[in-house]
């Protein structure tokens, strides 16, 4: 069990003095009601802070904003509002930071009552800005091409699609009545358009278009489109099937040149599809149940995105606000956590360690007792609070947290019982990617990971009292030290640290308030003197990921290989440093039937690892047919799980069967697709029907 603050811990010597010398206060002398932070570039130390203050007067809103810049990770800020001519910047999508380390920033100004708008753009990490008038009013944040930060895409409030090829200096209108637009790979743009004038009323009558040359030419790659999404190397479209209001998923891996029908159940108008996670190997797809059930089924795809295996039933995904607890645990390969809605209507957490192959309840922490929800006081599980709990108003200040470079570490709010509890949650930490958990902190906290896991920082959530304490741990949450960063408590609003968890700096944001005065304040603490030496070879130890049984010579084998990591010893108090790279060594495992999924036309009977042929494909199963290239229609009954690297061992061989006789598919064929050169194409209407939230890749 993890000792808390009061028990004997490996205390860091003289930490109070060391932290006091590295605590930097900054007072923002403005009365703004909201503040937003953006990091510019990676390891640059540059932060932009936008404070905004809005007052509605009759039919219009009077607003004021201020812009501040730091180049030392938030220790000091300079007011640079004059660089943007004291213009009011929109707080909702006002700051757009360029990809990678481009140093590009676009600020979108709010020019009320105008037919156009204004942006300020910087290419030098916000040292200087150039003002640019826009011939349109943006509907959403300007989108950078992931491949070229000079290429910008914008959707206007009149649903026009605009592109700039010179970082916003000049804009060209690509298309009218565009409902949704996205950058694909290689500077390709995908968008849906509707010639009938409305995006909201005519869902299912949209056309999907592609331009690979920034608008010189266009190609229709789909029709009768309800929605589309991109995930990994897959392009998905939900398409009306011609059977009333039903629609089905079609998938393309060649940018929409050819399509195959996904082997997924069709859905009606009150249901939805959602890509929960995707990479270049596979996709997690949620398919909503009919009716207002609040749950659906997770399916996992094969490497083509076509054949799907049922992964988890009764998966919680509310239709109202679109809340799901689905979380990719980025600190360990193959691990995902989500919630199910049980038959008794209770919400329960589930975890998978093998990319959705099997789901189990989370193991009860050693140092915790089952709460009142537990029928058996000895038998219960840990349940994780995520987006659903936040949406229902529980005191959960943060979503679960994991970082790829902090191997194995997961931090989350949770409760221990038969189901998620409405009681005050505590903070739990796993150091092995979710296999085992320890109660780390009593009550709700904000938390963050610094120095690739070398330090974990937390601040207690206290809505009614001011905050002046920060807690930190140098041993992955086993022991905690408390530091008073100020004498006078502040009303705490959040923790901020540079994305990527490589920084040694943490900023505590809040405000002070008196009868006549309120101002924003930040305290930035640099932990460099706590971790005063660089880590050496002796500070790291070998750790086998996914180890559940050390005596098994297949221990740690997940998706056909095992990985040994060099991990910082809990007892080592040293700096991983900004340049820290996770050291891991993979080893291939022998194949077993668990490394294969059943191919199209085959299924696994319950409690059997063998794939057997479906007796007959009939009725609506015909909609699950594979369409496209010839090899899609041949199968040996088994297909390697996407990303599985096993070799040798079991190698299931089946006679190749031709399924062409059994089914057909009639989605838009490549020969029916049309192309056109640029000249503004017609159509009208507008809807932003796919949104990204909680890192969900696509929700219709």
């Amino acid at each position: 069990s993890a000792p808390g603050e009061d028990e004997e811990c490996g205390r860091v010597r003289d930490f109070v003095a060391k932290l006091a010398n590295n605590t930097h206060q900054h007072i923002f002398n403005d009365l703004s009601g909201s503040v937003s932070l953006s990091w510019v570039g990676d390891s640059t130390g540059v932060i932009l802070v936008l404070t905004t203050f809005q007052v509605p007067i009759f039919m219009i809103t009077i607003g004021q904003s201020k812009l501040y810049r730091s180049e030392d990770y938030g220790k000091n800020f300079k007011d640079i509002t004059d660089l943007i001519n004291n213009t009011f910047i929109r707080s909702d999508f006002g700051i757009a930071i360029g990809p990678e380390n481009s140093g590009k920033v676009v600020l979108t100004a709010d020019v009320s009552g105008s037919h156009g708008s204004r942006i300020f753009r910087s290419s030098d990490f916000a040292k200087n800005f150039v003002q640019q008038e826009l011939p349109f009013v943006p509907l959403m944040q300007i989108m950078y091409s992931p491949q070229n930060s000079d290429y910008l895409l914008a959707l206007s409030n009149k649903n026009e699609l605009w592109v700039s090829k010179n970082f916003g200096g000049k804009w060209e209108k690509l298309y009218d009545t565009v409902c949704l637009a996205k950058w694909g790979s290689d500077n390709t743009i995908f968008f849906t358009a509707n010639h009938n004038g409305s995006c909201s009323n005519d869902r299912g009558m949209l056309e999907l278009w592609r331009t690979s040359d920034l608008g010189k030419s266009f190609k229709t790659i789909g029709s009768k489109i309800y929605s589309f999404g991109l995930g990994g190397r897959f392009l998905f479209a939900s398409v009306m099937t011609g059977k009333g209001t039903l629609r089905a998923i079609h998938v393309s891996t060649d940018q929409g040149d050819t399509w195959s029908m996904a082997q997924l159940p069709p859905v009606g108008h009150e249901q939805f599809y959602s890509i929960l996670a995707a990479n270049d190997d596979m996709v997690f797809m949620h398919v909503d149940e009919p009716g207002d059930s609040g749950f659906g089924t997770i399916f996992t795809s094969d490497d083509r995105g076509i054949v799907y295996s049922k992964s988890l039933e009764r998966h919680l995904y509310t239709t109202t606000g679109g809340e799901t607890d689905f979380t990719n645990v980025t600190s360990l390969r193959g691990v995902y956590i989500t919630s199910i809605l049980a038959e008794d209507k209770s919400v329960q957490s589930m975890i998978t360690f093998d990319q959705g192959g099997r789901w189990t309840h989370l193991r009860k922490p050693e140092n915790s007792k089952c709460d009142a929800t537990a029928r058996d006081p000895e038998k219960c599980s840990l349940h994780i609070h995520a987006a659903y709990s936040i949406a229902t108003g529980l005191n959960v200040p943060m979503l679960p947290l994991s970082e790829p470079n902090a191997v194995g570490i997961v931090i989350a709010h949770g409760s221990v019982g038969d189901a998620i509890s409405v009681m005050r949650p505590d903070v739990y930490i796993s150091d092995d990617g979710g296999y085992s958990w320890t109660k780390a902190l009593e009550g709700p906290h904000h938390y963050t990971i610094l120095d690739s896991g070398g330090i974990i920082v937390a601040v207690e959530q206290n809505a009614h009292q001011g905050v002046n304490q920060i807690k930190f741990s140098t041993d992955e949450g086993q022991c905690w030290q408390t530091y008073n960063f100020t004498k006078d408590p502040i009303f705490f609003t959040g923790l901020a640290s540079e994305p990527g968890a490589r920084s040694m700096n943490i900023s505590i944001w809040g405000y002070r308030s008196s009868l006549f005065h309120q101002y924003w304040i930040s305290y930035t603490i640099d932990f460099k003197d706590i971790l005063e030496r660089n880590c050496e070879e002796k500070d790291y130890t070998i750790w086998l990921a996914h180890s559940t049984d050390p005596e098994d010579y297949e221990d740690g084998c997940i998706l056909g290989y095992k990985e040994q990591f060099l991990r910082l010893r809990k007892s080592s108090v040293c700096q991983n440093g900004r340049d820290y790279v996770v050291t891991k060594q993979p080893s291939i495992c022998l194949c077993s039937l668990e490394d294969f999924l059943c191919d199209f036309g085959y299924y696994r009977p319950e409690n059997d690892s063998k794939c057997v042929e479906q007796p007959e494909l009939k009725g609506h199963d015909l909609e699950f047919c594979l369409y496209g290239r010839e090899e899609h229609l041949t199968t040996n009954g088994y297909r390697k799980i996407p990303g599985d690297k096993c070799q040798g061992g079991v190698n299931p061989v089946r006679e190749v069967k031709d399924l062409k006789k059994k089914c057909t598919s009639n989605f838009l064929s490549p020969e029916k697709q049309n192309s056109k050169s640029n000249g503004s194409a017609g159509g009208s209407g507008g809807l932003n029907d796919i949104f990204e939230a909680q890192k969900i890749e696509w929700h219709e």
Epitope: L544, E551, G556
Partner: antibody, heavy 120, light 107 residues
């Protein structure tokens, strides 16, 4: 003192059988995987067989599969190797070795070995 | 099966000299590589486990390094008592295998 002592070796004719024993002391025998490793005269080391602490996992080298059987008795702190259908190429010193407790661990404790000679 | 190729087969070295023995695996075995010393008419003894971790009681002149497929055992300043055969061993994948051995003799 942590110790492994092998016994049961000797001269046997091809096709014959022999049962080797390994007596463990000085550690909690029931917590460790145990192994047999052999070494032919003037040659290198060759792994023969492995058994987990509770006998859940048993592994053999292809060269002995179907002929040799590994077993253990945790109550008696003893490891065994039943060798049937012996061949001339099974002639070797047979060592009993403890595997460390980590995943994919090394053989940290070895016995002094017992000689098995298969000859007509 | 994973084949471990040890080199050299034989080395004749003067005391205080540095000895380097390499072991190459036919495929990646991560850090699951161990080194043993076997003196004439004795059983093997563990020197290094998991590629670089010294086993308790082993003199500090013995060290190991490497990962994946290439591994090295170094004896920093050879002593007369180090005359022995040295074997590498992989525990990453069944069947467990050993290298062919390197015999170190004192000049």
């Amino acid at each position: 003192e942590v110790q492994l002592v092998e016994s049961g070796g000797g001269l046997v004719k091809p096709g014959g059988s022999l049962r080797l024993s390994c007596a463990a002391s000085g550690f909690t025998f029931s917590s460790y995987s145990m192994n047999w490793v052999r070494q032919a005269p003037g040659k290198g080391l060759e792994w023969v067989s492995s058994i987990s602490s509770s006998s859940s996992y048993i592994y053999y080298a292809d060269s002995v599969k179907g002929r040799f059987t590994i077993s253990r008795d945790n109550a008696k702190n003893s490891l065994y190797l039943q060798m049937n259908s012996l061949r001339a190429e099974d002639t070797a010193v047979y060592y009993c070795a403890r595997r460390g407790s980590g995943s994919y661990d090394a053989f940290d404790i070895w016995g002094q070995g017992t000689m098995v000679t298969v000859s007509s | 099966e994973i084949v471990l190729t040890q080199s050299p087969d034989f080395q004749s070295v003067t005391p205080k000299e540095k000895v380097t023995i390499t072991c190459r695996a036919s495929q990646s075995i991560g850090y699951s590589l161990h080194w043993y010393q076997q003196k004439p008419d004795q059983s093997p003894k563990l020197l290094i486990k998991y590629a670089s971790q010294s086993f308790s009681g082993v003199p500090s002149r013995f060290s190991g390094s490497g990962s994946g497929t290439d591994f090295t055992l170094t004896i920093n300043s050879l002593e007369a008592e180090d005359a022995a055969a040295y074997y590498c061993h992989q525990s990453s994948s069944l069947p467990l295998t050993f290298g062919g051995g390197t015999k170190v003799e004192i000049k």
